[in-house]
């Protein structure tokens, strides 16, 4: 089959990096600088991925691959392939359409990027407090108050009055 | 709030040289890339050059590359676009606009500046 | 360099009607592909940025679908102020625009 498709078609003998090309005969040309051809029998060259702006050179584009990019520092990729970048924030952060913001009271990012969730509500497991939470971090429950023998552990469980996974102001 | 302001706009005759500048406020200017584009009465964009934010790396179109100049000076907040051998077909409202940093979008223009070149 | 060809270079619609506008590249560009909108003697104005995603501030009767090659800019119920010239824009290398379409009143 491989034979009868080349006398058929001559560019299917063009390797990966060229292409066929229709204005010298059908002969195999290597791909014109800043394009790639991936696959053989191509009959054009595809433009190479720029890396700029935000965007900087992960791999370099070669003839036979495209380039790929990544994000400059401060920023970090979204979407398929990098198709688009987000300034990164601090831990205990998360970004808005005004830039980076302090998470709110009851809620961390333990991240560079994504939102501000919740602290866990250890309550709704029946267990208590035993690390307060933070911007930057989750609380950590422990075992429920019923479960500690007394002076069996020196964990105080929190106040009534305070909601369960808050950290005191 | 973010504003940019393009100036230098002339009439020029064909082979003359313009200098155009673009003012930017309401951001932290060095930290974008800056492009230029323009637009010839009655036709549709062109995107003309582009610049990093420290002006260590730029891009033109191939029909201005030689010919023009784009620089910045991040301590006035200013970009310049230097025009040299000016042709009849560089007539055209140039605009100038900030990269969003995200993917390649430009999420704020200036209102251009008009340049006509003609004998 | 890719060609960016845009459909129709113009069209005449009505308030409340549903605008379609499509963009097509010479070559796969992902979803590097940018729409924005320009009304006579104005700079433009960005609308939709990464083929999909809504620009700030940009009302949400305007959505852009499409990757690859084939890309839609859509007005779900077309408004007095919408009627303007939209581009659509490749970022995937050297930037480059579509020729343009201009919405007209029916």
């Known amino acids: 089959f491989e034979r009868t498709r080349s006398l058929q078609d001559p560019c299917s003998n063009c390797p990966a990096g060229t292409f066929c090309d229709n204005n010298r005969n059908q002969i195999c040309s290597p791909c014109p600088p800043n394009s790639f051809s991936s696959a053989g029998g191509q009959r054009t060259c595809d433009i190479c991925r720029q890396c700029k702006g935000v965007f900087r050179t992960r791999k370099e584009c070669s003839s036979t691959s495209n380039a790929e990019c990544d994000c400059t520092p401060g920023f970090h990729c979204l979407g398929a392939g990098c198709s688009m970048c987000e300034q990164d924030c601090k831990q205990g952060q998360e970004l808005t359409k005004k830039g980076c913001k302090d998470c709110c009271f009851g809620t961390f990012n333990d991240q560079k990027r994504g939102i501000c969730r919740p602290w866990t509500n250890c309550s709704l497991d029946g267990k208590s407090v035993l690390v307060n939470g933070t911007k930057e971090r989750d609380v950590v429950c422990g075992p429920s108050p019923a479960d500690l023998s007394p002076g069996a552990s020196s964990v105080t469980p929190p106040a009534p009055a305070r909601e369960p996974g808050h950290s005191p102001q | 709030e973010v504003q940019l302001v393009e100036s230098g706009g002339a009439l020029v005759q064909p082979g003359g040289s313009l200098r155009l500048s673009c003012a930017g406020s309401g951001f932290t200017f060095s930290n974008f890339w800056m492009h230029w584009v323009r637009q010839a009465p009655g036709k549709g964009l062109e995107w003309v050059a582009d610049i990093s934010g420290d002006g260590s790396e730029k891009y033109y179109v191939d029909s201005v590359k030689g010919r023009f100049t784009f620089s910045r000076d991040n301590a006035r907040n200013s970009l310049y676009l230097q025009m040299n051998s000016l042709r009849i077909e560089d007539t055209a409202v140039y605009y100038c606009?900030?990269?969003?940093?995200?993917?390649?979008?430009?999420?704020?223009w200036g209102q251009g500046t008009l340049v006509t070149v003609s004998s | 360099d890719i060609v960016m060809t845009q459909t129709p270079s113009s069209l005449s619609a009505s308030v409340g009607d549903r605008v379609t506008i499509t963009c097509r590249a010479s070559?796969?560009?992902?979803?590097?592909l940018n729409w924005y909108q320009q009304k006579p003697g104005k700079a433009p104005k960005l609308l939709i940025y990464?083929?999909?995603s809504l620009q700030s501030g940009v009302p949400s009767r305007f959505s852009g679908s499409g990757s690859g090659t084939d890309f839609t800019l859509t007005i779900s119920s077309l408004q007095p102020e919408d009627f303007a010239t939209y581009y659509c824009q490749q970022s995937y290398s050297t930037p480059h625009f579509g020729g343009g379409t201009k919405v007209e009143i029916k």
């Open positions: 990464a083929a999909s």
């Open positions: 070559q796969s560009i992902s979803s590097y």
């Open positions: 606009a900030r990269d969003a940093m995200r993917g390649g979008d430009l999420d704020y």
